[in-house]
Amino acid sequence: EEELQVIQPDKSVLVAAGETATLRCTATSLIPVGPIQWFRGAGPGRELIYNQKEGHFPRVTTVSDLTKRNNMDFSIRIGNITPADAGTYYCVKFRKGSPDDVEFKSGAGTELSVRAKPSAPVVSGPAARATPQHTVSFTCESHGFSPRDITLKWFKNGNELSDFQTNVDPVGESVSYSIHSTAKVVLTREDVHSQVICEVAHVTLQGDPLRGTANLSETIRVPPTLEVTQQPVRAENQVNVTCQVRKFYPQRLQLTWLENGNVSRTETASTVTENKDGTYNWMSWLLVNVSAHRDDVKLTCQVEHDGQPAVSKSHDLKVSAHPKEQGSNTAAENTGSNERNIY
């Protein structure tokens, strides 16, 4: 009888992660008597995958009944394949022997390649908020995919971005890969409702790319503009002064009124109105009793927005005459003022 040959008909097998791999192996003879074993890799460091004789291999099932002497089909199925299972598998026939079974003949090997889907892309923005006109960086990461070929695109509100850098690691052969990309985005005042999207396309996704998003509302800070105005007289000795805080984001804002540099009242923005672009407006007013002042009064609206240094606008009230309806729109920042009083 011709000497036994071990035949592995498939040079390679491609399997999607999570599925079952079938590794085929047949022998051409029933002799010699002895077990079949499957290994991943060759040489001294090879990993035992299945031993017909002994051991527990919960992920492995045999295609045919290997317990029977007349069996010559030694194919196995490996369940729940992961990228870590990739490699070359060898079907090896042993001859029954003492003290140990002796390796008799090996198959040529079957390379198992695993197609694994990338994980959902995770997009993260800068740790601190930034203001319009500043450039911020966003990162996108996805892991665990195989094969290595992958495409990554960035979008802002549906418009593809071009200023980004992408790396796929590792550079050499691996069971699975990771992608890391950094995109630069210039912020505008209208970006509160904007989204940055990272899109990953891979052969395992069958044309349906994965997307990760970041809302620029988590990244942007739109500083407020202030306007202090004097309203018509309410009573003979009272003046109503308003501070309009416009176009700010996020909502966290504290306003302090100062009369001649002394704190008169502090309040936190609560009932704000939202603009279409996602920014907020808020108005605070101060009722000033003119008769309580002998000299002119300098009123300052001081706003601390989102933990940033305070900005302010001032308005001068003269007490020498009864004030009439007047408006003030001072352009000076911080404690500066630009008087325009009408009597």
């Epitope: 009888e1 003879s29 029933l30 008597v33 002895g34 029977k68 002497r69 007349n70 029954k96 140990d100």
Partner: antibody, heavy 118, light 107 residues
Framework: EVQLVESGGGLVQPGGSLRLSCAAS????????MHWVRQGTGKGLEWVSA???????YYPGSVKGRFTISRENAKNSLFLQMNSLRAGDTAVYYC????????????WGQGTMVTVSS | DIQMTQSPSSLSASVGDRVTITCRAS??????LAWFQQKPGKAPKSLIY???SLQSGVPSKFSGSGSGTDYTLTISSLQPEDFATYYC?????????FGQGTKLEIK
Amino acid sequence: EVQLVESGGGLVQPGGSLRLSCAASGFTFSSYDMHWVRQGTGKGLEWVSAIGTAGDTYYPGSVKGRFTISRENAKNSLFLQMNSLRAGDTAVYYCARGGNWDDAFDIWGQGTMVTVSS
Amino acid sequence: DIQMTQSPSSLSASVGDRVTITCRASQGINNYLAWFQQKPGKAPKSLIYTASSLQSGVPSKFSGSGSGTDYTLTISSLQPEDFATYYCQQYNSYPYTFGQGTKLEIK
């Protein structure tokens, strides 16, 4: 149904010969190693002979040169030719199939009695 | 030749008992050990092969273990039909050899 049926046993004088047969059915006979095992009255089991799928044969020292195992795959039959019989060969002779991958016996016949006596 | 020594040679037990029979080989047999059950006037019946693999159709109350030279057969809960003679056999190398048998009797 997988079955082994022995025949050919009987009374024989010391120095005589006997040919035992084992008829196999219910499986592909040619694909299995086959064995003969005997058991003396009130005694334990003793392996007597084996034949592989390729016709290779094996014997213990106690019967070597006297017993010959053979097979006829076309007729699904196993044979044991016993020559120069001795009183110590008196036993029930069983044929057994090396039915497991490792040649462990999985199926046994019901046995045939061989008595060597003058 | 490899000698197989079984112990005990006889054993009395009750229904429901758990019993263990041991078999020692004169040299390593690489787990190529089988266990058989035989009742009077009947052919042996295969129970276990390769030291611990259960033959098809054999109830799981029978289990085998061991390696090297020392092997055991355990019957977890004896039933009346389990009272018989048990043999071990090495088939690692020719000539195949059997133990002398263990007769399991009802106490």
